[in-house]
Structure formats: C-alpha cells, structure tokens
C-alpha cells in the first residue's frame, strides 16, 4: 500500500525540459453523439512561438491515417484546419497552450478505435512528438429515437407523413395507421449515417398514424393525427 501526495504532485510532474503527452485511457460515447478526445502535452522549448502543426491519426501511432491536421502561423493562436475527415473533426484545444483536444461529431460505430495526437514544431526549434499509446474511442450502439414526425401537404390535396429516426445500428422504420395495408406503403430512405427517414406517401383516411423505429437495442414509437375538415383541408398533429 503506497502513500502519495496529490496536493504536491509537482514532484511527479514532467520536468520542464522534456516531451510528454497525456491522454486518458478511453473515451466512451454513443453513436450519433459527439465526443472529445483529450490530449495535453509538455515540451522542452520554453515560450515556443514559431509555426506548429497539430495532427490526429487513427489506428496506429506514426503510421496510421490522419483524420485531422491544422497549422498555426508564428505567433498565432488560430490553428487553421488543413484536414478534417468527412468534416467531422475539429480542434477544441489550443496547441499554443499545450492542448490538442479534438472533438468528433456524429459518431458512428466504425469510429471506434485508437487515436493518436501529434504536435510538430516547424520553426527554428524543429521538433515533434506523438502519443505512443493513444486514446481508445469506444462508440456504443444507440437505441432508436424518433427525432421528427410530421404531416405535410402532398399532391392533389393529399397528405404525406414523414418520420425520421436515429440509432446505431440504423433502425428499421414502419408506419401503421387506419388505412388497410397501410404499413406496406412506407417508403424508406436512408438518411446520413445513423439517421433514417420513412415516408407514408398518401394518407387516405383520417386518424392516428404511428411510426415505429426498431433496432437490436430497442424500439421507439411516435404518432401523428390527421383530421381533414370539409370546409378546407387541414391537419391536426
């Protein structure tokens, strides 16, 4: 049983004259959400103000494909993005202040894996450092969630219903309603990534129309009501 002193961790901290990179072991997030991959570093070049490049790569250190890269001009705190895979990666930290933390938007299960941060000083002090172990991103499946359900006017005074749901794996959508054989009329279109949309193209009867989203983790339901009045067509939802 060891004893330590966190109120005096200076004793355990990286000496001013060496490189070190700090990342957590793991970051957990649900598919469809965003996640922050933290990374901070120390370096031996006191008050370095020259040009720098911040890089994140996936898979393996030093050789894995880059998913993000930005460069900061001498004296600038703005790191100009040069690469952001699928536009989903953005720097949250400030490399000038030893923070390379990265935000990943719209996570998919395929984003799971290990990520490695790297900083390169490209001025007089030509130096670079990369995390060896990286941070593991665990993207977990998400139960379905209906994010939008609506009735819209269609052609020839008809109405159509739209249902958008998200989940990972992408949920299967089904419509049910007062019309006979109603659910077979649903047109399912793939949205982006973890979102799917299903359309019921012609609502022929008044009543309640229910959209059901289901995947291996669960199911979600939402309903919309159609009431047409004799004077002027309309809906109540």
């Amino acid at each position: 049983d060891a004893s330590g002193d966190l109120l005096n961790t200076e004793a355990h901290s990286a000496p001013a004259q060496r490189w070190s990179m700090q990342v957590p072991a793991e970051v957990n997030a649900e598919a469809g959400d965003a996640a922050v991959l933290p990374c901070t570093f120390t370096h031996p070049h006191r008050h370095y103000d020259g040009p720098l490049t911040a890089i994140w790569r996936s898979g393996e250190p030093y050789a894995g494909p880059q998913v993000f890269r930005c460069t900061a001009a001498p004296g600038s705190e703005l790191c100009q993005t040069a690469l952001s895979l699928h536009g989903r990666f953005r720097l949250l930290g400030n490399p000038r202040r030893n923070d390379l933390s990265l935000r990943v938007e719209r996570l998919a299960l395929a984003d799971s894996g290990r990520y490695f941060c790297r900083v390169e000083f490209t001025g007089d002090a030509h130096d670079r450092y990369e995390s060896r172990h990286g941070v593991r991103l665990r993207v977990t499946a998400a139960a379905p969630r209906i994010v939008n359900i609506s009735v819209l006017p269609g052609p020839a005074h008809a109405f159509r219903a739209l249902c958008t749901a998200e989940g990972e794996p992408p949920p299967a959508l089904a419509w049910s309603g007062p019309a006979p054989g109603n659910s077979s009329a649903a047109l399912q279109g793939q949205g982006h990534g973890y979102q799917v949309t299903a359309e019921l193209p012609a609502l022929t009867r008044d009543g309640r129309y229910t959209c059901t989203a289901a995947n291996s983790l669960g199911r979600a339901e939402a309903s919309v009501y159609l009431f047409r009045f004799h004077g002027a067509p309309g809906t109540s939802t």
Partner: antibody
Framework: QVQLVQSGAEVKKPGASVKVSCKAS????????MHWVRQAPGQGLEWMGW????????NYAQRFQGRVTMTRDTSISTAYMELSRLRSDDTAVYYC?????????????????WGQGTSVTVSS | DIVMTQSPDSLAVSLGERATINCKSS????????????LAWYQQKPGQPPKLLIY???TRESGVPDRFSGSGSGTDFTLTISSLQAEDVAVYYC?????????FGQGTKLEIK
C-alpha cells in the same frame, strides 16, 4: 493551502439559468483541470465535465451537452459553471473540484480539493 | 459508460472493528500500458464536500490515516478501514477515471453499530 470558494445558494424557476463561480487560491490555477460535480438531495455524485483553465478547453458529460457552459477568468483564478433551461431535477448541490495536474505523466484525474458546494433549488 | 456498483449500500460496524466496502466496475479499469488501476475512493461526511482518500486503487492520499487501505485490480476493488473510529462515519464513494465520462459508485453509508 489549496482552497476553492464557491458562490452562494441560488433559487431559480424552471426554464431559467444559473451561474456558479469557484475561486481558486493556494496553487497555480492554470496548471490543473477544474471539474464540476453535482449531488442531488440524498443522492450520489454525478460528474458534469471539466475545463482546462490553461487552454479554455472543455469536456462535458453527454447528458449536459447543450445546457452546460464552463468558463474561466484566469486573471482572478475563477472558474464558472452555467446551467440553462433548468428543471426541477436539477435541484442539487454543485461542487467544483480540482483535477489533474496538466504536466503529470499519467492521466491521474482525481479530485483532490473541493469547493464547499453551492445549493441550487429549482422550483416554481 | 462504465457502471460502478458498490456493496453494501449501508454498513454498521463496531468501533475498533474492520469495515470493508466493495466496488465493482462493469469493465476493467486496469490500463495495460502502465499496469495501473484508474480507481479512486472518496469519503463524504454529512454537510461536507467529498474528500479524496485513495487513488490508483491503493495509493493513500497524503494526510489520510493508514487505517484506510485500498486493494483490488481490474473490475473488483475494496476499501478497508482496519479499525473503525467514530470520525469515520460517512458515505464512501468509488470513482473510475479510466474512461470518460467519469463515473462514481452509488455510495456506501458507514455507521457505528
């Protein structure tokens, strides 16, 4: 010695926002993460997120995303946590707590000094 | 997210006796790169903020009496108070800092029998 002093108790209506402050002393404010943790009446501890006072980088727990904002003012060594669109189940004591030393080799992100807590009551 | 489960929920122990609190994580918090368990224990007395007791599963924080000790690895951890004192009455929490978001156990209330 390390001290974190928080602002006083607040009573808010549902839908309103609350901003809690945490003034640090006895150490270099920009050398350590600052965490926010809350505790509902008679309940356990819930991590809300952190701010890196050196870089202003933040990391929020997913359930608070879009409602919480953590900021800091390095000139007065103070961290802030603002929670918006308050609901009755946000009624809790909110703590700031000092986290990891940024220069430490390992990711030792435990909370070794805590504020006294700020009671936030949300009631109509 | 990693779920931390403590047992028992409450515990009554006589003064001078040993108190044992268990904490189980839903996944391992042992990091193979440095062979460290990313687990901490906190003590919270009524009306006070929590206080750090132990980190890395078994390293006692400075100023914490040596009757407090932590053990375990991977998913199963134990906080032991070798000889209970009156001032040890509190709620004890385990916390993992291996995986973000950080999570705490539900707490174990320790009372005197």
């Amino acid at each position: 010695q390390v001290q974190l002093v928080q602002s006083g108790a607040e009573v808010k209506k549902p839908g309103a926002s609350v901003k809690v402050s945490c003034k640090a002393s006895g150490y270099t404010f920009t050398d350590y993460y600052m965490h926010w943790v809350r505790q509902a009446p008679g309940q356990g501890l819930e991590w809300m997120g952190w701010i890196n006072p050196n870089s202003d980088g933040t990391n929020y727990a997913q359930r608070f995303q879009g409602r919480v904002t953590m900021t800091r003012d390095t000139s007065i060594s103070t961290a802030y946590m603002e929670l918006s669109r308050l609901r009755s189940d946000d009624t809790a004591v909110y703590y700031c707590a000092r986290g990891r030393l940024l220069r430490f080799f390992d990711w030792l992100d435990v909370m070794d000094a805590w504020g006294q807590g700020t009671s936030v009551t949300v009631s109509s | 997210d990693i779920v931390m489960t403590q047992s028992p929920d409450s515990l009554a122990v006589s003064l001078g006796e040993r108190a044992t609190i268990n904490c189980k994580s839903s996944r391992s918090v042992l990091y193979s790169s440095n062979n460290k368990n990313y687990l901490a224990w906190y003590q919270q007395k009524p009306g006070q903020p929590p206080k750090l007791l132990i980190y890395w599963a078994s390293t006692r924080e400075s100023g914490v009496p040596d009757r407090f000790s932590g053990s375990g690895s991977g998913t199963d951890f134990t906080l032991t108070i070798s000889s209970l004192q009156a001032e040890d009455v509190a709620v004890y929490y385990c916390q993992q800092y291996y995986s973000i978001p950080y999570t705490f156990g539900q707490g174990t209330k320790l009372e005197i029998k």
